[in-house]
């Protein structure tokens, strides 16, 4: 994993999210339901599975959440688009790691991400997208905790 650093500006992504977090969470019509938030599964991921889970969660956001979300507010849309773009580059960086066979997917990792997709599927698509965006800080905190994120000067 040490050879598979995510070279991106996590601080910038977190800042962008904090600026829109309140507006996004205010649109959440199912406040008592969670997709990522209470996931103990994420807390018990072994170091060996971090790359795979990160890869799968990036794919979840890039291929599902950012595609399903319809944002009418141009300012919020700009911030979400910027976060999505950063995720896309992170995804491509991890794909490089995968090519070098440094990103194995074991059953535990697959199960953890399946739970997230199942939770997402239980809600109407736009509600699920809003909720997942509102829980972005859970994913960002998890990345920060589990990865040596390279802050380039």
């Amino acid at each position: 994993l040490r050879r598979c650093l995510i070279s991106t500006d996590m601080h910038h992504i977190e800042e962008s999210f904090q600026e829109i977090k309140r507006a996004i969470q205010a649109k959440d019509t199912f406040p008592n339901v969670t997709i990522l938030s209470t996931l103990e599964t994420l807390q018990i991921i072994k170091p060996l599975d971090v790359c795979c889970v990160t890869k799968n969660l990036l794919a979840f956001y890039v291929d599902r959440v950012f595609k399903d979300h319809q944002e009418p507010n141009p300012k919020i849309l700009r911030k979400i688009s910027s976060i999505a773009n950063s995720f896309l580059y992170m995804q491509k960086t991890l794909r490089q790691c995968q090519e070098q066979r440094q990103c194995h997917c074991r059953q535990e990792a697959t199960n953890a991400t399946r739970v997230i997709h199942d939770n997402y599927d239980q809600l109407e698509v736009h509600a699920a997208a809003i909720k997942s965006l509102g829980e972005l800080d859970v994913f960002l905190a998890w990345i920060n905790k589990n990865h040596e994120v390279m802050f380039s000067a």
Epitope: S7, T8, D9, H12, V62, D63, F66, K67, H69, E71, L77, R78, I80, S81, S82, A84, N85, F87, L88, Y89, K92, R95, Q96, E99, M150, F151, S152, A153
Partner: antibody, heavy 122, light 107 residues
């Protein structure tokens, strides 16, 4: 208006280095990844790598690893591409190009500099 | 590195013709793919991104299709300003690679 303006043509000797600049205006410089693409005379396009102007993070094509350095100066909204140990086959037009920011996210170079001709000749 | 093979390498067509250019990738690249137009002495111009999304400001006569390994750029009715060289680009795997180009000339 929104544009990328590159530095002027350069003539270099083999073994020397060249540093091409790319000044952004009309948009938030730190909000878009910048790529460098080159084109040898009468040839096709070749991707060299990218820089994230916000963090300074880079990714270079393996072919140029160890010879290319991409940097930026956010205070003047300018990106730089330095290529060292120049050879005659590095003679090309060097372009900087901005990546789009769209939802859902995708790659696409929607804004290009005018190009900088670098000639390597003894 | 992923190789992109464009065909044909050149073609002659008349104004009003329907023109199709294909690009084949050496491996599956999903939809991480785009098309660019370049005129002599000018920088390339983005036409299509994500295999089929039309870039803002690009005429609707241009369209892109395909995913996986086979991609197509179609110009439904060729206009005088469309005579140029067209390149495909894959951004699925590093290093990102361009096709060798297709030159569209006046018949």
């Amino acid at each position: 208006q929104v544009q990328l303006v590159q530095s002027g043509a350069e003539v270099k000797k083999p073994g020397a280095s060249v540093k091409v600049s790319c000044k952004a205006s009309g948009y938030t410089f730190t909000g878009y990844y910048l790529h460098w693409v080159r084109q040898a005379p009468g040839q096709g396009l070749e991707w060299m790598g990218w820089i994230n102007p916000n963090s300074g993070g880079t990714n270079y094509a393996q072919k140029f690893q160890g010879r290319v350095t991409m940097t930026r100066d956010t205070s003047i909204s300018t990106a730089y591409m330095e290529l060292s140990r120049l050879r005659s086959d590095d003679t090309a037009v060097y372009y900087c190009a901005r990546d789009i920011v769209v939802l859902p996210p995708a790659i696409g170079f929607d804004l290009w500099g005018q190009g900088t001709l670098v000639t390597v000749s003894s | 590195a992923i190789q992109l093979t464009q065909s044909p390498s050149s073609l002659s067509a008349s104004v009003g013709d329907r023109v199709t250019i294909t690009c084949r990738a050496s491996q599956d690249i999903r939809s991480d793919f785009g098309w660019y137009q370049q005129k002599p002495g000018k920088a390339p111009k983005l036409l299509i991104y994500a295999a089929s999304s039309l870039q803002s400001g690009v005429p609707s006569r241009f369209s892109g299709s395909g995913s996986g390994t086979d991609f197509t750029l179609t110009i439904s009715s060729l206009q005088p300003e469309d005579f140029a060289t067209y390149y495909c680009l894959q951004d699925y795997n590093y290093p990102w690679t361009f096709g060798q180009g297709t030159k569209v000339e006046i018949k």
